[in-house]
Every structure is written in structure tokens, then in C-alpha cells.
Amino acid sequence: EWVKFAKPCREGEDNSKRNPIAKITSDYQATQKITYRISGVGIDQPPFGIFVVDKNTGDINITAIVDREETPSFLITCRALNAQGLDVEKPLILTVKILDINDNPPVFSQQIFMGEIEENSASNSLVMILNATDADEPNHLNSKIAFKIVSQEPAGTPMFLLSRNTGEVRTLTNSLDREQASSYRLVVSGADKDGEGLSTQCECNIKVKDVNDNFPMFRDSQYSARIEENILSSELLRFQVTDLDEEYTDNWLAVYFFTSGNEGNWFEIQTDPRTNEGILKVVKALDYEQLQSVKLSIAVKNKAEFHQSVISRYRVQSTPVTIQVINVREGIAFRPASKTFTVQKGISSKKLVDYILGTYQAIDEDTNKAASNVKYVMGRNDGGYLMIDSKTAEIKFVKNMNRDSTFIVNKTITAEVLAIDEYTGKTSTGTVYVRVPDFNDNCPTAVLEKDAVCSSSPSVVVSARTLNNRYTGPYTFALEDQPVKLPAVWSITTLNATSALLRAQEQIPPGVYHISLVLTDSQNNRCEMPRSLTLEVCQCDNRGICGTSYPTTSPGTRYGRPHSGR
């Protein structure tokens, strides 16, 4: 049976004066020689040789200073051996407890703690939790840390409360005001022995977050400006406001609005995000003849909603703005503001180039006459079909059109014409609508049964031919008006749905005749231009065979009647 005792040892002290600090004996010692051996940490394991045993007596001595934080207790394995080196007892585990001394200060987990809290937060709102540890014995006074605020910057009324035991930083009042102090620096100490022992300091940086608790206020009580009629302005006036909330945030950013006077939507207010100024813009021209001055009322709020702490105090405060409209000499304008041109029915979509639509001149509003010293150009010109003469304002086609063009909407193409005053550079815009027909690009054509007839019986059958089946019979055959001062020479009589008889109404001399024929189908569709039929009338012999041939481009070419020459 073992007989044992062990005294606790204090760290950081020379405990050798109290040796032996432990003793082991076996009751077998009374009957035989016993040798004592010890092993374990501090003996034959690092740190080596702290404990030694007297092999004969079993006295255990301490030989070195120990550190509790390194080894809170030593477990010594003890053996009692007989002369043969055999254990006479079961090995004994002897515990030597190391007593703590306060040799470690508290250590904060961060040298600087960062936190943030909204201004106007309720008192006792949690800001942050500080964290510190002490290496001394847990649950012992040596490691019990007490926190306290050493200093606050800016100084003055203490704004924060630090829980002595938990390290919680809370607001002391509900009067945090970012506009007074946007951040606080606390120096905090943590002392062990519940505040009486070793201490360490750390820093707490607390950012006071902005809330929208300040109303934007106009710097001036009223504003005024002057603007010429008929013009737009990207900056007529600037309004300055003061807002104490954090710059460049939505709490600071001003939103300007009209409370009255802008019923005509002439004005807009845009915020300059750099300066927070309101920029009054004229987006719709004013007319002096209708309005000589405009009395606006404006107000301002923020992009962000106001904080609940102040919202009940917000009132829309209108600030007057007087705009004086200045009369100017009237410029140029298109009257009416749009003009419609119509492409003649029957024009081919492939024969539009150089087709003249007409003129669209701007007028001088002072004289109500066609404007002089203006230059005309096309503005919007989808598809690029139209061109305007810079001086005469004559509009023509410069491009042929695909009948399926996406620019034809409701049989109309739309473009804009600009008139630029060469003195002032002012521009007026007119809208051009061009109504286009259903282009008859495959319109019916006429063919003569023969291209030569005898002068004795000058008649020939004309037949209608079509290139596609959109043109349906019956066809109407008509002769284009003969040149003025000439009596009608030819007549045409319908024979059936697709042909007619062309004949001379009187005896006519031999020659080559060009006869203009107009063909119209049952839907009243017709070609762009009359068909020009070339017919040779010749002197025939008694067998009805032509005797003379006439060149088609000679000066003697006939247009319905004999040509008298030059």
C-alpha cells in the first residue's frame, strides 16, 4: 500500500525551500529494500528534471521555477521496485498542482475595434462588443477582466456606456448627432482582478451613421430670371440649398419640384449631383405673346425619405421664382407645321429619282412671307429618299423605292425639313408627309396587232397584256389628249375585255405616227405614263402591201397628224 502526500507549488517562485514537496513510501519498505522511481512531464519528459526523487526515501524535490500557464499541474508516475527490479505496488499517479499568480495582463482581440451606429438611435442600443482574454487561471480573480472607458473623443457629454463585465458598448443617450460628431474614439481599459489588477488599453472607433434628419433649405427666399421667348435653356437658374446631412448621400441629395406655376410644363429642375444645386431648365419654349411672366413656386426634399424622428415636422415650404419672358423678333417657322405631298397615281416605284414633290418653304413670322436668308436641309429622312434644295426648298426624290419598304407606313413616308436662319443659326423644323400610291410596277401594256397599216384603211387592233395577274380585265382604252390646236386624228373603240380598235378618223398621209394610249383596269389601276404606240401608215399597192418605209426618228415623225417639218 502506498503512503503519499504532495504540496501545491506556486508558479514563478522558488519552491525548493519547501522540499520535499511530495513524499511516497510503500509499506513493503518495512520488510525489504525498496527503490523509488518517478517519471512523467517535468522528470523524464520536457521540461526535464524539474522533479527528482530520493530513490531510498521516496522524497520528491522541486528543482526549478514553474509556469502555471505552461503547465497547470504535473502528473508524476511513481513506482516502488524490489531488489529484483520488480514493482511491488501498482504505479501511482501523484498530482502536483501549480498555484496561479497574476502574472498575465488582459489581451484585447484587436488593438482597434471598429463599430457604427445610426445617429438618433435609442439609448442602450448595442454598438459593439469588446473581446479580451487573460492567460491566468480561468474563473479566478487573476483572469476576471473588468472593462471601463478611459476617455472619449470628442470629449464632453459621455455618449457611450461600456458594460464592466460583458464588454458591450451601448449608447448612453438617444442624442447621437452625426452633424455634431460624425465619429467617436474611445480609449478603453481592461483590468484583471476585476479591475484591480493588471490592465491593457485598446481603442474603439465608432462611426455615427447618417440618417435623413435634416431638411434641405433654400439659401435664398426668392429667385428671378429672364429668358427670351421661343428658346430652350439647359440652365436658366441655379438654386442653392443647405442640407446638413452627409454629403453625396441620398439623405443630402436634393429633389426639387414645382408646387405651382408650371402647368404648361415649360420647366424642369435637375439636380447637379456635384453641388446639390437645382438647375432650372426651359424644356418647352415660352411665347411672349401668350405669357409675359411666369410665377413659379418650388420646393425641395431629399432623394431619401425623412427619418421617422423628424418626418412629422416636415412641411412643404414653397419658394417663389419669377421668370420674365423677353419678347424677341420672331424668327422663321414652317406654317403649317407639316405638309403632305402626293406622288401621282401610276408613277413607277422604279422611276422616282428626280420626281418633284413641290416646295415647303419656311415663313418669316414677322412678315408672314417666305423666309429669306435661310438654308434648307433634310432632318430625319428615313430611307434617304428625299432631298431638299438648300435655297428654293424644292423637295424631290433622290432614290427609287421598294414597294415593300419598311419606311412606308399607311402608304406614307415621313421626313423632317429644317430651315436654318443664316444670320442667327436658329432652326425651324417642318414635317413632310409623302403619300405614295400602290406602285403599279407591273402595269398593263398595249401591243399592236401589226405595226404597219395602209393609208386607205388605217385601222389596227390593240391588245392589253399584263405581266402579272394583279391587273384584271376588262380594260378601258383611251387616247391621251392630242397636242393643243390639233384636231383629233385617231379614235379608239373597245372590242372586248382585252382589246380595242384604233383607227384614223380621216384620210391621213403616210408616215410614222406616235399614238399615246392610256390603259386602265377594272380597279382603276393604270400605268405611270401613257403607252406610246408607234404605227407606220404607208401607201399600199393593190395587194395591200406597204410600199414605202419611214425612219422612226426622222424629223417627219408624226404625233397624231402629219408633221409639217421645221
Partner: antibody, heavy 113, light 111 residues
Amino acid sequence: EVQLQQSGPELVKPGASVKISCKASGYSFTAYYMHWVKQSPEKCLEWIGQINPSTGGTTYNQKFKAKATLTVDKSSSTAYMQLKSLTSEDSAVYYCARWGDSWGQGTTLTVSS
Amino acid sequence: DIVLTQSPASLAVSLGQSVTISCRASESVEYYGTSLMQWYQQKPGQPPKLLIYGASDVESGVPARFSGSGSGTDFSLNIHPVEEDDIAMYFCQQSRKVPYTFGSGTKLEIK
């Protein structure tokens, strides 16, 4: 079918004037500009000017402004070009044209003493 | 005035070959996405005949062997294959700005 029939060749003395005609048929005469082009013996083509047959409005190449006068007679669908103070430099073939797609056969003008 | 420089002044090709005639404008003849450039063929004793308009649109009735290309200031007329009937003078013309101007012409001959 569009046809432009021009008057015949002209032989005139220096300093005189000449009026060339161009009769249009087969299309709406007043709907398109009538252009006039000079082709000198070296074969190069020069645009003289254009006339709007509907209004009589003209646009000239600055080079020919003092030389040519363009007119029309709507009733006969005929365009005219008068050339004045003629010199040998004016000897050329003159064409009328409805844009580029229809041309007259050309009128040869010879200026010689 | 817009000056049109045509090249070459003349060229001789074998029948069946391809030929390209160039025309360079002193400034752009582009107008809202369309090049206002025409090409004409002229045979002796005849008026010019329109081949190509809008730089690349082939006039109706003109054989498919004629084609036009280019935009801005550089244009070309291509004939492929060349036939006997193509022996003629060829002119480019711009209608972007008054005065409308013509190139100096290219004479096409057969080898």
C-alpha cells in the same frame, strides 16, 4: 415609253444666239426636272443646269449661268435652252435628259464664221 | 465642285474577260446611306445610257454582267464577262451636289 425629241443640228456664227428645243412625251412632263448636258468634241460631259417644268424654277452650273437660259412650255411639253454670245468653245453636242434614265438624241451645235 | 477622277482613261480587254473601271470623288457622295453615283455607257453617235444608279442598282433592261460597287468616295463599275457590244465610253456621274459632275470617261476597246 419616255421619249425626248430634240431639234436638229445648228450651224451659227460667233456672237449669235441659238435656242434648242426638247419635246417630251410618254410621261408627266411637269413631274420631273429636265436637265441639260454639254458634250464637247473631247467627249467630256458637263452638266449645264436643270429646270422644274412645273414652276419654271432653274438651277444652273455657275460655269454656264451667263451662257445658258432654260425655259419650258408646259402646253407642248417642251423644254428649251438658249445659248448666247456663242464662240467656238460652245461647239458641242447638247443633250436634254430626264434625270439619267432618258436622254434626247442630242443636238449638234457648230459655231463657225 | 465635286471632282470625279476616272481611271483608266482607256483599256483593251479580251472578250469574256472581266473589267473594272474606277471612279474617285473629291468628297463623299453619300446621302443618308445611299451613294448618289451613276454609271453610263455611251456609244458613238448616241446619248449616254444609264447602267447603274445609287452606286450599285442596275437599271432595268441592263444586262446582269454589269455591276457597280463602292461608297463614300471610291466607286467601281465591273463588267463580267465583256462582250463585243460593250465597246463604248463609260462615265461616272454624281448627283449629290449641284453642279452635278461627270468623270472624264474610260474608253473600252477589244484586244
